[in-house]
Interface confidence: low
């Protein structure tokens, strides 16, 4: 007789389980809810993450488990737990039918569960012609630390450890979890297998053509012979990593990830948990020609995402595809034939592309920095990373035209020396994803935890948005920007800088009605201006143009539209001093900037006036851009005129204490 | 429940042929991987071959490829391993086992398993 399932040859019902009894109701008014990959073929059904709530005990997570097996018995499926999750994240992988999914989610403890996907190594093509060992110069590159107080983890293939540029750096873990490989012919071939993961190997550490030549590495094997690997398994890797840092706690942590799979909450939620741990994390963007947002690790905010340029810092297109783009990439590096180990033969060497290549660049940086300043923190090491790249050489023209605005122009470099960057601000620049076009919509930028939000601004394509508003969520401030009717949506983007002793607060004034205009200064003795926004009910504020010029004398002074209300960020920190610079255009003008000075960090960015015309205000690098309509769809010259205002801040603080170590 | 008996071992040639069959009962889902694995004396198990549940997919390890050919019945709930040309090394007690419920094309990992046979040992002489 079959079952329901048709998934037996006889149905037996199961023995009552001592627990499926306890069957505890979930939470009351808390659903779980189920996710899977968005890309139908990179699916694996029948597999599922089920994670558990932040504060479950492994006993717990034992418990729901068995729980789970004991209920679907009695329904007559089988089910089987892969593993238990404890470390990064409460849960358990199960092999199931997924008909048991609205019975798995009704479980005390549940969380959310997710289906299984697949992850991919993210180099093209993986053997291209051999080369002859390059040889090097005495004045080639030569690090003064490479990294030698770091370990790197590299979640890869297999590699071939015996390579003679990185034997001796690489330790081979005991760790491997990959699926089986496609197709009932496939013929393993040592030297395929190895291929991506000792090329990255060497690309990070190797003797010749490594970027850290000091760092030591460990290798877990996540992807298979065809560099497929599974979330579950790199889920798995990641909880092997903090278990191993748990056990024996060493230095500074980096770990490579250059795979990418769809958009997974699970495998962000790992990351950002072993980031918060301590880790500094690095991943491929994506081969994808695409925005980086819809791939993971990729789009999990607490990790380090590279995009790959080429030898003339443009995008590398790798076949139909290339390197993906937008928001979520923090910064690109070489990635476009690039030398490294060949797992053909022990002293081979071979060119391989791709957003793999970029990320073990970067982690390679990365190691260096970390061994000159083992106290950096994530936040610290990914404004240095920002910091000290190269800015606005990539041609954007190769990015599709909504995502050149999103997408950092930015290519790593080392930094001249490894010290003495500690006297400067750092800031950058998040990007909120999109809003959407209704009515109401918002949308939210937010920085990392140890860094300052001190400005917040918006931006939408069609100029119909209700300005942008920075408040407190979680402890936090956040900068949320408001889409207005008719509106095809907006994006927030805040200023997010590293400020060390830093107390900041939000001063409101409500809309004025008067012809001067709303204005909001900082009052509080100590307090610096560092950021104005302004935010309007209205649909369209019309064209009345407040004064650009403020009262001498009052530097720390939001002025705005009558019809909004203004909020100005004020910051008190050790030596922070800021300044208010302008540029005004009296005629129109699709674009109008201006920028902070050599020593001096731009905080803040906004546009006056507020008008509809003006399509928004965004930060780039130390530039403040204030962009308006097309000058042809706007009517009169008057209202085309643009100011863009922005804050440059520089801390005598921090200065004074980079001297001091000097 | 499955249970899993081996049998057909015992002491062959070098170069001869021998034919192992895996009988399962009890509880058998419709879908899964009836696997053959080896383990010498001192050795790991290791995987040998591996058959989908419709018979027409099935995966060697390198070392059989060519040489054994695995077959199912899944009217009669069991699984064959015809090897040929066999030779010394392939000298081991050879396990039958069942992974139940597949998230893989195939499953040659030990970990993979659910259920195992006892064993039917395979001895070639030289």
């Known amino acids: 007789q079959e079952d329901e399932d048709g998934d037996y040859e006889e149905l037996v019902l199961a023995l009552r389980s001592e627990e499926d009894g306890l069957a505890e109701a979930p939470e009351h008014g808390t659903t779980a809810t189920f996710h899977r990959c968005a890309k139908d073929p990179w699916r694996l059904p029948g597999t599922y993450v089920v994670v558990l709530k932040e504060e479950t005990h492994l006993s717990q997570s034992e418990r729901t488990a068995r729980r789970l097996q004991a209920q679907a018995a009695r329904r007559g499926y089988l089910t089987k737990i892969l593993h238990v999750f404890h470390g990064l994240l409460p849960g358990f992988l199960v092999k199931m039918s997924g008909d048991l999914l609205e019975l798995a989610l009704k479980l005390p403890h549940v969380d959310y569960i997710e289906e299984d996907s697949s992850v991919f190594a993210q180099s093209i093509p993986w053997n291209l012609e051999r080369i002859t060992p390059p040889r090097y110069r005495a004045d080639e590159y030569q690090p003064p630390d490479g990294g030698s107080l770091v370990e790197v983890y590299l979640l890869d293939t297999s590699i071939q450890s015996d390579h003679r540029e990185i034997e001796g750096r690489v330790m081979v873990t005991d760790f491997e979890n990959v699926p089986e490989e496609d197709g009932t012919r496939f013929h393993r071939q040592a030297s395929k297998c190895d291929s991506h993961g000792t090329h990255l190997a060497g690309v990070v550490s190797g003797r010749d053509a490594g970027v850290a030549k000091g760092a030591s590495m460990r290798s877990l094997r996540v992807l298979n012979c065809q560099g497929k690997g599974t979330v579950s398994g790199t889920l798995i890797g990641l909880e092997f990593i903090r278990k191993s840092q748990l056990v024996q706690p060493v230095g500074p942590l980096v770990v490579l990830l250059p795979l990418a799979g769809g958009y997974s909450r699970v495998l962000n939620a790992a990351c950002q948990r072993l980031a918060r741990a301590g880790v500094v994390l690095v991943t491929a963007a994506g081969n994808f020609r695409d925005d980086a947002c819809l791939y993971s690790p990729a789009s999990a905010p607490e990790v380090i995402t590279v995009g790959a340029t080429n030898a003339q810092d443009q995008p590398v297109t790798l076949g139909t595809l290339g390197t993906n783009f937008g928001r979520c990439v923090d910064l690109f590096a070489p990635g476009e034939d690039i030398i490294g180990a060949s797992s053909d033969c022990s002293t081979c060497f071979v060119s391989q592309s791709g957003t793999s290549q970029a990320a073990a660049h970067v982690a390679g940086i990365a190691a260096m920095m970390l061994s000159a300043e083992p106290e950096l923190t994530l936040a610290e090491l990914r404004q240095r990373l920002i910091h000290f790249s190269a800015k606005d050489v990539i041609n954007e023209a190769w990015f599709p035209e909504d995502q050149r605005v999103l997408t950092p122009n930015l290519v790593a470099a080392l930094p001249p020396s490894t010290h003495g960057a500690g006297w400067q601000l750092f800031c950058r620049t998040v990007w909120s994803a999109h809003s959407g076009p209704t009515r109401m919509a918002t949308a939210v930028a937010r920085c990392a935890p140890d860094e300052e939000l001190l400005s917040c601004s918006s931006f939408s394509r069609s100029g119909k948005r209700r300005g942008e508003r920075m408040e407190a969520q979680g402890g936090k401030l956040v900068c949320r920007a408001h889409n207005a009717f008719g509106g095809e949506g907006v994006y927030a983007i805040a200023r997010c800088c590293l400020l060390p002793q830093a107390n900041c607060s939000v001063h409101t004034a409500p809309p004025a009605e008067a012809s001067m205009g709303t204005r909001v200064h900082c009052h509080q003795q100590g307090h610096v201006l560092t950021g104005c926004s302004s935010h309007w009910e209205v649909e369209d504020l019309g064209t009345h143009k407040p004064p650009v010029l403020r009262p001498r004398g009052q530097p720390n002074q939001c002025v705005g539209h009558r019809e909004a209300s203004i909020h100005a960020s004020c910051c008190h920190a050790p030596g922070l001093e800021c300044k208010v610079k302008e540029h005004g255009i009296p005629a129109p003008q699709e674009q109008v900037t201006v920028a902070c000075e050599e020593g001096w960090t731009l905080t803040g960015c906004s546009a006056l006036p507020g008008t509809s015309h003006v399509l928004g205000a965004y930060a780039v690098d130390n530039t403040c851009v204030v962009r308006s309509r097309d000058v042809s769809t706007t009517g009169s010259t008057s209202e085309g005129a643009v100011t863009a205002v922005a804050i440059c801040c520089r801390s005598r603080h921090l200065a004074q204490a980079s001297q001091e170590l000097q | 429940q499955v249970q899993l008996v081996e049998s057909g071992g015992g002491l062959v040639q070098a170069g001869g042929s021998m034919r192992l069959s895996c009988a399962a009962s009890?509880?058998?889902?419709?879908?899964?991987?009836l696997g053959w694995f080896r383990q010498a004396p001192g050795k790991q198990r290791e995987f040998v071959a591996a058959?989908?549940?419709?018979?027409?997919?099935?995966y060697y390890a390198d070392s059989v490829r060519g040489r054994d050919t695995i077959s199912r019945d899944n009217t009669k709930n069991a699984g064959d391993l015809q090897m040929n040309s066999l030779k010394p090394e392939d000298s081991a007690t050879y396990y039958c086992?069942?992974?139940?419920?597949?998230?893989?094309?195939?499953?040659?990992?030990?970990?993979?398993?659910?259920?195992w046979g006892q064993g039917t040992e395979v001895t070639i002489s030289s």
């Open positions: 009890g509880r058998t889902p419709r879908h899964y991987i």
């Open positions: 058959i989908r549940e419709s018979g027409s997919r099935t």
């Open positions: 086992a069942v992974d139940q419920y597949p998230t893989t094309e195939f499953s040659t990992q030990v970990g993979h398993y659910d259920y």
